[in-house]
Interface confidence: medium
């Protein structure tokens, strides 16, 4: 598909509006600290240049690669060295090293102010005054805070964001209409960002083969009626799309994602009976809908897997002839029969099968050696089942907040070196697995829970990678993608940890806590809980519960007091002293 001008090709394929939006996202994901106005200026310059190339593909510089064009543009930013430090050194490199350098400097936890939501009337005025700038600002703010956000999906979020303002700014009660929609978009956006971050980590840290294996398993569960060759085709195309997006090639990624949605809809008869509604939607909605589509029904007459993968005399021959295709077939066949398993469990089973064949096909009697391979799967299946059962029981007993607290204590004891904000964020998200998945029937619990936990633990891994402080976290994060969750589950209390010095300032609270939202108040309390465990890692559940109950009562009491600040100062000292006594600090 050689085009004289790549930039003209993508401009024509995507249209001006999507082209501009995607270039803005790309630039904001690379230069996360740059002001909005600077990015808009760069995007406009690139767009004007693209238009000259559409008019004449032979015009000067139109034959340059997108990386060259975009990199050259980013390197014109005057304050690059002052703002980004060593990232400026990327500009001394040639493509493709320059783009790789920019990618390496993406920051998963950029030092940016929290996004504060203005009053509804203020937002509606801004929306009406300049709709285009308002929506661009949304793209910019999300993209710079989430440098791996799936760009074509961010266009879909922006479309919904615009629709929410269009509808609600005309409503009688603007706030009642708008705020729930914005909350929903925020929560979905965070989830979408985290899911995509795992895909990029999978590709970048474990390679294309790991991502393809994940995709074979997931698509086989989703499309169990599709033939293996069809699933393979979809996996190949999907891998290309995500490789491009994770590599910063957002125009190509969006273009190829649209092509993939088109292909799926044109061939839905041989893929899935569940695609009909998705395929009637406009492009952005269609792609989103396909990505979220429910699993199709399993074919009724699927034969036993043992015949082809254990009993057949040709197992080692088939394996030797084309290992990855044979293992792909195994994974496809197993996954389409098990929508009740998590993808990571299916990948563990496939890895066990592969290891067994590697060993047995070199043995004197291969069949005798691998005859019992399916028996090895039993403990692998039971481990997540038991874990989910236990944790759902605990969640139902405690409720979400207290379940999060139990996980906070558990994880702080496992990896106390990790920063408190990271432990709070990750444990809160781990705790959300309860309300997200425990309501499901048994058949849906494991894929919901374990695959969600993979996403959350990846957040821990990418945040920890930026400033590594724990060898145990590094080990669990890097050894095996599919065994991350079992690795963390298996960690016991870190006996080598030297407890943190007690600092009364950490446990000093002020009247401003009273005006916080319930969620922010919880985060304050959970931050204190993590700090307590870091000071006293051997504290029992009962001791910690007593201190936290006292703390909750203290906050409630002082927030009702007439002189709140005095109450926090005086009662706070008493609380710290009582807590020290209770914990033996």
């Amino acid at each position: 598909d050689a085009h004289k001008s790549e930039v003209a090709h993508r401009f024509k394929d995507l249209g001006e509006e999507n082209f501009k939006a995607l270039v803005l996202i790309a630039f904001a994901q690379y230069l996360q600290q740059c002001p909005f106005e600077d990015h808009v200026k760069l995007v406009n310059e690139v767009t004007e240049f693209a238009k000259t190339c559409v008019a004449d593909e032979s015009a000067e510089n139109c034959d340059k690669s997108l990386h060259t064009l975009f990199g050259d543009k980013l390197c014109t930013v005057a304050t690059l060295r002052e703002t980004y430090g060593e990232m400026a050194d990327c500009c001394a490199k040639q493509e493709p090293e320059r783009n790789e350098c920019f990618l390496q400097h993406k920051d998963d936890n950029p030092n940016l102010p929290r996004l504060v939501r203005p009053e509804v009337d203020v937002m509606c005025t801004a929306f009406h005054d300049n709709e285009e700038t308002f929506l661009k600002k949304y793209l910019y703010e999300i993209a710079r805070r989430h440098p791996y956000f799936y760009a074509p999906e961010l266009l879909f979020f922006a479309k919904r964001y615009k629709a929410a303002f269009t509808e609600c700014c005309q409503a009688a009660d603007k706030a009642a209409c708008l705020l729930p929609k914005l909350d929903e978009l925020r929560d979905e956006g965070k989830a979408s960002s985290a899911k995509q971050r795992l895909k990029c980590a999978s590709l970048q840290k474990f390679g294309e083969r790991a991502f393809k294996a994940w995709a074979v398993a997931r698509l086989s569960q989703r499309f169990p009626k599709a033939e293996f060759a069809e699933v393979s085709k979809l996996v190949t195309d999907l891998t290309k799309v995500h490789t491009e997006c994770c590599h910063g090639d957002l125009l190509e990624c969006a273009d190829d994602r649209a092509d993939l949605a088109k292909y799926i809809c044109e061939n839905q008869d041989s893929i899935s009976s569940k695609l009909k509604e998705c395929c009637e939607k406009p492009l952005l909605e269609k792609s989103h809908c396909i990505a979220e589509v429910e699993n199709d029904e399993m074919p009724a007459d699927l034969p036993s897997l043992a015949a082809d993968f254990v009993e057949s005399k040709d197992v080692c021959k088939n394996y030797a002839e084309a290992k990855d295709v044979f293992l792909g077939m195994f994974l496809y066949e197993y996954a389409r029969r098990h929508p009740d398993y998590s993808v990571v469990l299916l990948l563990r089973l496939a890895k066990t099968y592969e290891t067994t064949l590697e060993k047995c096909c070199a043995a004197a009697d291969p069949h005798e050696c691998y005859a019992k391979v399916f028996d090895e799967f039993k403990p692998l299946v039971e481990e997540p089942q038991n874990l989910i059962k236990q944790n759902c029981e605990l969640f139902e007993q405690l409720g979400e907040y207290k379940f999060q607290n139990a996980l906070l204590v558990r994880y702080t004891k496992k990896v106390p070196q990790v920063s408190t904000p990271t432990l709070v964020e990750v444990s809160r998200n781990l705790g959300k697995v309860g309300s997200k998945c425990c309501k499901h029937p048994e058949a849906k619990r494991m894929p919901c829970a374990e695959d969600y936990l993979s996403v959350v633990l990846n957040q821990l891994c990418v945040l920890h990678e930026k400033t590594p402080v724990s060898d145990r976290v590094t080990k669990c994060c890097t050894e095996s993608l599919v065994n991350r969750r079992p690795c963390f589950s298996a960690l016991e209390v870190d006996e080598t940890y030297v407890p943190k010095e007690f600092n009364a300032e950490t446990f000093t609270f002020h009247a401003d806590i009273c005006t916080l939202s319930e969620k922010e108040r919880q985060i304050k309390k959970q931050t204190a809980l993590v700090e307590l465990v870091k000071h006293k890692p051997k504290a029992t559940k009962e001791q910690l519960k007593a201190v936290m109950d006292d703390f909750a009562a203290f906050v409630e009491k002082c927030c009702k007091a007439d002189d709140k600040e005095t109450c926090f100062a005086e009662e706070g000292k008493k609380l710290v002293a009582a807590s020290q006594a209770a914990l033996g600090l």
Partner: nanobody, 119 residues
């Protein structure tokens, strides 16, 4: 009735090239993944290469990777196998087949075309 007719086989020296063709009829070729399999004298069936209905992706057995290229022309209902750098161990009866729905079983195949590589 499904028919698959292979042609293009012959005798060739090591290092030489051949192009096999397979004319298909009796089923919707452009919605079927296809493959080439081969059977060397006195040996079992060995699959060689698979091609998806749309032309991509393609897969190759490790023994032929980098030497053989599978392709198709859906407008002509024809499957091809370009074989370069042929070796003595490539000597076999080559069959084209409709890719299995799922299991390691092939739905339909033709009569085969013989490829002999010898100096």
């Amino acid at each position: 009735e499904v028919q698959l007719l292979e042609s293009g086989g012959g005798v060739v020296q090591p290092g030489g090239s051949l192009r096999l063709s397979c004319a298909a009829s009796g089923f919707t070729f452009d919605t079927s993944s296809m493959l080439w399999v081969r059977q060397a004298p006195g040996k079992g069936l060995e699959w060689v290469s698979v091609i998806h209905q749309s032309g991509t992706p393609t897969y190759y057995a490790d023994s032929v990777k980098g030497r053989f290229t599978i392709s198709r022309d859906n407008s002509k209902n024809t499957l091809y196998l370009q074989m370069n750098s042929l070796r003595a161990e490539d000597t076999a009866l080559y069959y084209c087949a409709k890719f299995p729905s799922s299991r390691m079983k092939f739905d339909y195949w033709g009569q085969g075309t013989l490829v002999t590589v010898k100096s």
